[in-house]
Amino acid sequence: LIQERRSHQNNPAAHLTGANSSLTGSGGPLLWETQLGLAFLRGLDYHDGALVANKAGYYYIYSKVQLGGVGCPLGLASTITHGLYKRTPRYPEELELLVSQQSPCGRATSNSRVWWDSSFLGGVVHLEVGEEVVVRVLDERLVRLRDGTRSYFGAFMV
Amino acid sequence: LIQERRSHQNNPAAHLTGANSSLTGSGGPLLWETQLGLAFLRGLDYHDGALVANKAGYYYIYSKVQLGGVGCPLGLASTITHGLYKRTPRYPEELELLVSQQSPCGRATSNSRVWWDSSFLGGVVHLEVGEEVVVRVLDERLVRLRDGTRSYFGAFMV
Amino acid sequence: LIQERRSHQNNPAAHLTGANSSLTGSGGPLLWETQLGLAFLRGLDYHDGALVANKAGYYYIYSKVQLGGVGCPLGLASTITHGLYKRTPRYPEELELLVSQQSPCGRATSNSRVWWDSSFLGGVVHLEVGEEVVVRVLDERLVRLRDGTRSYFGAFMV
């Protein structure tokens, strides 16, 4: 039982939450709260929006983003892409891990209609020590932040 | 290997399923089947809709609800809120953990159109012994139950 | 620590990815890439679209499918069903485990409008040795495959 408890206490896990500073508008990944509220890091590090692996292995990574808007810009059902991406020293470009595309504002049948949608991603990926995972949303202007419960990003070793 | 198997057998986990009695209409949380069919409890308790932690630690908690209806009431794209909430004796009001807002019936462009949508939530949260997690849906009248496979609620320690 | 690492290295886990060959049109389950790219099998087997348990226990199983299309066939908001199903020698028919129904193309208000939607399922189920889990989508013609990041299927023991 001591062994089992120790195993859980050491198992890498993290849950990061959305904050007003999450959306940078700079074309970079979303940034996250790592310590206060519901957020925590256990055996994983954080750097500029990225969860960083301290231990090699398979991780279940997940992210949810809350989307919302009023009507459809230019009457178009714009496509929103929400994805989890890996950064690794061996490759200069980020690698797509898990991605979703949605056309949520097509739900609003007039330009003044408020709409909400949510996108959830989760899956198991392998991370080496030092490899990073980030969340990107295109177009991030449609991400609706409030209090850390609607948009978030996490992982745990499996 | 014996150690490893024992560890898994003792790891708290649960999966609860929707049933006709899930929707109470009382303003309370959804209620769940805990034993029949796909439902089970292992190292977690259940009380009035809530999963109750018997062991302190970080848990991946999740819920899915199946939504559906015919047309949009009053032609409005009503917002549905699906959330996981924590109850703890010190704080009588539930604490939001993971929440989604959706406007699914905006998908139906006429009042006679049948629509379906699904909302999934999952994330890692900390629970102390005796703390409870419940699921709420507003408006719960749009939750469509059938056989325990479309709406459910679960957790496991990570 | 050795014990803890061994436990993780042996813990059954898998992540399978969508490929051009995933959609058979034969009425069978989706097929998956098991080795290339992001796909892997660790302590689970694969057979004709199915993840096969080598070790009895509770597994968190998950699947995401990327849906997309142009307009709504016949102007109808067609219902898409995405589900995880269990095959077991004891029963001739597949058992529903986790299922979602969605009406995504209702988002497009004209017949020429492109729409995208995503469906995610995840939950804990019990598998005996030799039992299989498959993914089905009806109508699978609306599944949009690309590079293994948008439609996938996985599991790990909890």
């Epitope: 007003n20 310590q35 206060l36 925590f40 890091l41 209090d147 | 900390h126 | -």
Partner: antibody, heavy 117, light 110 residues
Framework: QVQLVQSGAEVKKPGASVKVSCRAS????????MHWVRQAPGQRLEWMGW????????KYSQKFQGRVTITRDTSASTAYMELSGLRSEDTAVYYC??????????WGQGTLVTVSS | QSALTQPASVSGSPGQSITISCTGT?????????VSWYQQHPGKAPKLMIY???KRPSGVSNRFSGSKSGNTASLTISGLQAEDEADYYC??????????FGGGTKLTVL
């Protein structure tokens, strides 16, 4: 129940250091941040910093940066706040407080530190 | 991080209602529903009275209520009693793992 018990009052000379302890009970010590807040006589509450008890990460108020060090001993469920280079204006009651979500609850009973030559 | 702005003092007679304001910015009070209020009697540790803008912990009288509008949060105490005389502090999450206290308000029950 959840409780924080702090060490007793201290009298220090200017230039010295003081280390105040805060022993936690009734909850999982490693799963919450611990904050330190001080209050000089007749003055307002002043946030000094926090420690993530689980991983040891710290964040300090700019005002105290370089003079304050917050540590913890997980085996003893105890957090510590050490303030160096003491001056007379550091005379205050020092409180530890558990971070629960986005508020402080509970608080320790306080430790009076008097800096006097 | 500059302190949230509170009035230095407020007063009221027993049975009356009083309101204490707490003004911040869109980066703290206005940006999140994460305002809490603490009561501190002389020589005692602060006590949580309100969390998440308007919620009361168990054991706190329902005479205490909280609200928020824009960048200003408010604590209202109805049916003032002698034992309510104390200092009151607001507190807010301010993003990026930072927090900020108010300057404190001394409540006098006349």
């Amino acid at each position: 129940q959840v409780q924080l018990v702090q060490s007793g009052a201290e009298v220090k000379k200017p230039g010295a250091s003081v280390k105040v302890s805060c022993r936690a009970s009734g909850y999982t010590f490693t799963s919450y941040l611990m904050h330190w807040v001080r209050q000089a006589p007749g003055q307002r509450l002043e946030w000094m910093g926090w420690i993530n008890v689980g991983n040891g990460n710290t964040k300090y108020s700019q005002k105290f940066q370089g003079r304050v060090t917050i540590t913890r001993d997980t085996s003893a469920s105890t957090a510590y706040m050490e303030l160096s280079g003491l001056r007379s204006e550091d005379t205050a009651v020092y409180y530890c407080a558990r971070n629960y979500y986005n508020w402080f609850d509970p608080w320790g009973q306080g430790t009076l530190v008097t800096v006097s030559s | 991080q500059s302190a949230l702005t509170q009035p230095a003092s407020v007063s009221g007679s027993p049975g009356q209602s009083i309101t204490i304001s707490c003004t911040g910015t869109s980066s703290d009070v206005g940006g999140y529903n994460y305002v809490s209020w603490y009561q501190q009697h002389p020589g005692k540790a602060p006590k949580l009275m309100i969390y998440d803008v308007s919620k009361r912990p168990s054991g706190v009288s329902n005479r205490f209520s909280g609200s928020k509008s824009g960048n200003t949060a408010s604590l209202t105490i109805s049916g003032l009693q002698a034992e309510d005389e104390a200092d009151y502090y607001c507190f807010s999450y301010a993003g990026s793992s930072t927090v900020v206290f108010g300057g404190g308000t001394k409540l006098t029950v006349l």
